[in-house]
Interface confidence: medium
């Protein structure tokens, strides 16, 4: 005979666990239904009645199947200088990220408390390590035979063009100038760019069943430019 399908709430067999999207209620000592994302447990189950779920209120959410008594609060509104990369809905938290060209310099579990502009490498210096969501650009002096003539948070040092006859030798901040009409070899025109940091933020998850920790959200502190560092400018 096929096994009967149990309807929640039901007492599990000794040593067995509750099924997917069910949880074991210690008080009722029964397997009971979890609430779907976007809902929370309004009334916990008993031996005779199943969990009663209710929709999350505005500005609150649950992302997973759960039995939390209240939905989690969405993080603070984004500041005017931030980008809201994920809106607050009943099923997901708001995510605010530092705007392009900025990175998070001071963070807490709730997210970024201080966004700062990415360092710009001045002429004679190129990007050694590109900025990310949480780290600044690292600049390095252009090595002999290379140059950078820009103030940029993305440009690397480029090789000097090789001339048949050099009119003006190149240096760290200027390309070589050739006398002949065309150099023997030159780089493709235009600056070489490193890609801007791309968000690698993982999908935020909410603990189940413990609702005490919320997923992180990023925040911005409007601020002035950073002071120049060696080989960099705060502009």
């Amino acid at each position: 005979l096929p096994a009967q399908v149990a309807f929640t709430p039901y007492a599990p067999e000794p040593g067995s666990t509750c099924r997917l999207r069910e949880y074991y209620d210690q008080t009722a000592q029964m397997c009971c239904s979890k609430c779907s994302p976007g809902q929370h447990a309004k009334v916990f189950c008993t031996k005779t009645s199943d969990t009663v779920c209710d929709s999350c209120e505005d500005s609150t959410y649950t992302q997973l199947w759960n039995w939390v008594p209240e939905c989690l609060s969405c993080g603070s509104r984004c500041s005017s200088d931030q980008v809201e990369t994920q809106a607050c809905t009943r099923e997901q938290n708001r995510i605010c990220t530092c705007r392009p060209g900025w990175y998070c310099a001071l963070s807490k579990q709730e997210g970024c408390r201080l966004c700062a502009p990415l360092r710009k490498c001045r002429p004679g210096f190129g990007v050694a390590r590109p900025g990310t969501e949480t780290s600044d650009v690292v600049c390095k002096p252009c090595a002999p035979g290379t140059f950078s003539n820009t103030t940029s948070s993305t440009d690397i040092c480029r090789p000097h063009q090789i001339c048949n006859v050099v009119a003006i030798p190149g240096n760290a901040s200027m390309d070589a100038v050739c006398t002949s009409t065309s150099p023997t070899r030159s780089m493709a025109p235009g600056a070489v760019h490193l890609p801007q940091p791309v968000s690698t933020r993982s999908q935020h998850t909410q603990p189940t069943p413990e609702p005490s920790t919320a997923p992180s959200t990023s925040f911005l502190l409007p601020m002035g430019p950073s002071p120049p560092a060696e080989g960099s400018t705060g502009d």
Epitope: L72, S76, Q109, A116, L221
Partner: antibody, heavy 120, light 111 residues
Framework: QVQLVQSGAEVKKPGASVKVSCKAS????????IDWVRQATGQGLEWMGE????????YYNEKFKGRVTMTRNKSISTAYMELSSLRSEDTAVYYC?????????????WGQGTLVTVSS | DIVLTQSPDSLAVSLGERATINCRAS??????????MHWYQQKPGQPPKLLIY???NLESGVPDRFSGSGSGTDFTLTISSLQAEDVAVYYC?????????FGQGTKVEIK
């Protein structure tokens, strides 16, 4: 306007616990931190920790870890600070203060303070 | 922990004169061009009141005779022209990292 109103003075015996409340109004309670700072009579200010009411996340000063518990009730916009295993040196005025998540990152509004006296 | 040391411990200044309070941190409280140092005023029987945030920003409603300066480890609160109502204890505080810490306080009186 932003207001933080704290519960009244308490007298406790050594070894007991005290729970101080801080009711917030005039802003979105879940958006900013509530910090707790204490001040013994004639002494300076000492930061005990903070809670982010939106999530319930807490950050405690190591000095008070194990003795302090910060909680909140979002529905009534109230934060709580409970200090256990009280000793005479815990006699102090306890303040709650709001600290914005971003912007100032300083405690820009304070409660009126709650005097806790620990005496046998 | 970051230790903040204020100097002097107390200060007596004539009305209308300049008062200067210093605060030195045991390590830098700067991060990406911002100084996470703040100044508070506390009068007897009252909670502290924020005067200056992030080293040099005047809190709304605070008279402009108060100003803050400094970066890294050394910070200054200046009262350009002391008024009778400025008699209080002044505290510096850092929020660069947990645990947040306060200076021991500087008492300002009228000479």
């Amino acid at each position: 306007q932003v207001q933080l109103v704290q519960s009244g003075a308490e007298v406790k015996k050594p070894g007991a616990s005290v729970k101080v409340s801080c009711k917030a109004s005039g802003y979105t309670f879940t958006d900013d931190y509530i910090d707790w700072v204490r001040q013994a009579t004639g002494q300076g200010l000492e930061w005990m920790g903070e809670i982010y009411p939106g999530s319930g996340n807490t950050y405690y000063n190591e000095k008070f870890k194990g003795r302090v518990t910060m909680t909140r009730n979002k529905s009534i916009s109230t934060a709580y600070m409970e200090l256990s295993s009280l000793r005479s040196e815990d006699t102090a005025v306890y303040y709650c203060a709001r600290s914005q998540v971003y912007g100032k990152i300083a405690m820009d509004h304070w409660g009126q303070g709650t005097l806790v006296t620990v005496s046998s | 922990d970051i230790v903040l040391t204020q100097s002097p411990d107390s200060l007596a200044v004539s009305l209308g004169e300049r008062a200067t309070i210093n605060c030195r941190a045991s390590e830098s409280v700067d991060n990406s061009g911002n100084s996470f140092m703040h100044w508070y005023q506390q009068k007897p029987g009252q909670p502290p009141k924020l005067l200056i945030y992030r080293a040099s920003n005047l809190e709304s409603g605070v008279p402009d005779r108060f100003s803050g300066s400094g970066s890294g480890t050394d910070f200054t609160l200046t009262i350009s022209s002391l008024q009778a109502e400025d008699v209080a204890v002044y505290y510096c505080q850092q929020s660069k990292e947990d645990p947040y810490t306060f200076g021991q306080g500087t008492k300002v009186e009228i000479k």
